[in-house]
């Protein structure tokens, strides 16, 4: 019970991490413009991954998008392939699963092998909110250096009375929505790991065991015996005790005086 | 089409208040913002403030402290409020109606005379 | 506050001439986000309210013969009246839309001889 919540829950955590790092990067806040400086613009401006913005005072709001590829510069192409390699794997990690998931039958796939899927989905989703954390990370790094290159040149060249005030950025939403959601990605694919553990079943100390009572001979098998899937303990079949209950491996069925009457 | 009209007291007595209503048609003031300017006799324009279509305002600073500017959207009106009037305050007081920061209609202006 | 300044004061010319004023701001209209130049011209005629022209420097109103032309980027505008007409008698105004206050030029005053 506690296998198939951990499970869910870390799908779920999962889902809506991924649904976060894509609004993150199709989100146009990425660096909106520092109003210190200039608090009574009338025109504000934010920049995305793939667009630039201008919202003017009247609710106007006008982007253009960034056409070029080779003029843009290397840490932004940088980030934007971090984010993609991140929904990509985040999105594979969600379909592969979904199939993983034990309250889900999917013909008579075994519990091993939902626990190999659920392991593989766990590290996509902590790879994904790895990548989306890094490539929010280098932006805010980015955005950083420059707000305080600016500043430094803030007011070089002024002219007489002339001020050429240069437009600083700083932190927009969606690194915010980055941060957090590439944090919850990889909760969600920790929890897919530690719910694999609990899917995956050791060997017993003992197999099916045949008893031999008085009367018909019955066969007692351990209920919920699980495939072994190379997690857990690899221990040789042995013989646990005497006095009847043999392994399986040993059993042999020969007629004893006492199974006729 | 778009018309805006302002309708004010005319003559104002120094230190009380100044009050005009701008009302407009042709559009609504959900959509766009509308400026106030003045122009006292023989002079240049003067950019007073403007209410954004939000509702949300700007001022001239030097005037900030006794100016206010308020709408009633439903009745398509807005609201000039100065206090502490002067006889520096003679002007012709006109709205404008915003498109994209600039100004593309105008009001006939109202005249205000700050006198005893 | 952004201090617009305007030459000349007056002018006065022939109708048939070309004209030109310019308009300094103490800083920058340029928003290098959409690459517009917040600045408006504005034709006063006596007696009436002002008449939009040019808006973003450059563009201008619809309505507005093409016989006038907005330039300049930055901090330094121009007005061009290429043929002038008799109807242009008129103050213009140039304007500062891109920082609170927008602040006005003091205007030139356009007379004809």
């Known amino acids: 019970m506690a296998v198939t919540a951990c499970q869910g829950l870390g799908f779920v955590v999962s889902l809506i991490g991924i649904a976060g790092i894509i609004a993150a990067t199709c989100m146009d806040q990425w660096s909106t413009q520092d109003l210190y400086n200039n608090p009574v613009t009338a025109v504000f401006n934010y920049q995305g991954l793939w667009r630039s913005c201008v919202r003017e005072s009247s609710g106007f709001t006008e982007c253009r998008g960034y056409f070029t590829l080779l003029g843009l510069p290397a840490m932004l192409q940088a980030v934007r392939a971090l984010m993609i390699v991140g929904i990509v794997l985040g999105a594979i990690g969600l379909l592969v699963s979904i199939f993983a998931l034990k309250c889900i039958r999917i013909g008579s796939m075994e519990d091993s092998a939902k626990a190999n899927m659920t392991l593989t989905s766990g590290i996509m989703f902590i790879v994904s909110g790895l990548c989306a954390i890094a490539g929010v990370s280098v932006f805010a790094n980015m955005l950083v250096t420059n707000f305080w290159m600016s500043t430094a040149n803030m007011y070089t060249g002024m002219g007489g009375m002339v001020q050429t005030v240069q437009t600083r950025y700083t932190f927009g939403a969606a690194l915010f929505v980055g941060w957090v959601a590439g944090g919850l990605t990889l909760i969600g694919g920790v929890m897919m790991c530690i719910a694999c553990r609990g899917l995956a079943p050791e060997e017993t100390n003992y197999k099916a065991v045949s008893y031999h009572a008085s009367g018909h001979s019955v066969a007692y098998k351990p209920g919920g015996f699980k495939a072994s899937t190379g997690f857990g303990s690899n221990t040789k079949n042995k013989k646990i005790y005497d006095g009847g209950a043999r392994t399986e491996d040993e059993v042999q069925s020969y007629p004893s005086k006492h199974d006729y009457v | 089409q778009v018309q805006l009209k302002e309708s004010g007291p005319g003559l104002v007595a120094p230190s009380q208040s100044l009050s005009i209503t701008c009302t407009v048609s042709?559009?609504?003031?959900?959509?766009?913002?509308v400026h106030w300017v003045r122009q006292p006799p023989g002079k240049g324009l003067e950019w007073l403030g403007v209410?954004?279509?939000?509702?949300?305002?700007n001022y001239e600073s030097a005037l900030m402290s006794r100016l206010s500017i308020s709408k009633d959207n439903s009745k398509s009106q807005v609201f000039l409020k100065m206090n502490s009037l002067q006889t520096d305050d003679t002007a012709m007081y006109y709205c404008?109606?915003?498109?994209?920061?600039?100004?593309?209609?105008w009001g006939q202006g109202t005249s205000v005379t700050v006198s005893s | 506050d952004i201090v617009m300044t305007q030459s000349p004061s007056s002018l006065t010319v022939t109708a048939g001439e070309k004209v030109t004023m310019t308009c300094k701001s103490s800083?920058?209209?340029?928003?290098?986000?959409?690459?517009?130049?917040?600045l408006t011209w504005y034709q006063q005629k006596p007696g009436q309210p002002p008449k939009l022209l040019i808006y973003?420097?450059?563009t201008r109103e619809s309505g507005v013969p093409d016989r006038f032309t907005g330039s300049g980027s930055g901090t330094d505008f121009t007005l061009t009246i290429s043929i002038l007409q008799a109807e242009d008698l008129a103050v213009y105004y140039c304007?500062?839309?891109?920082?609170?206050?927008?602040?006005f030029g003091s205007g030139t005053k356009l007379e004809i001889k």
């Open positions: 973003w420097a450059s």
């Open positions: 800083q920058s209209l340029l928003e290098s986000g959409n690459q517009k130049n917040y």
């Open positions: 304007q500062n839309d891109y920082s609170y206050p927008f602040t």
């Open positions: 404008a109606r915003d498109r994209r920061l600039a100004m593309d209609y």
């Open positions: 209410i954004w279509p939000g509702g949300n305002t």
């Open positions: 042709g559009f609504s003031l959900t959509s766009y913002g």
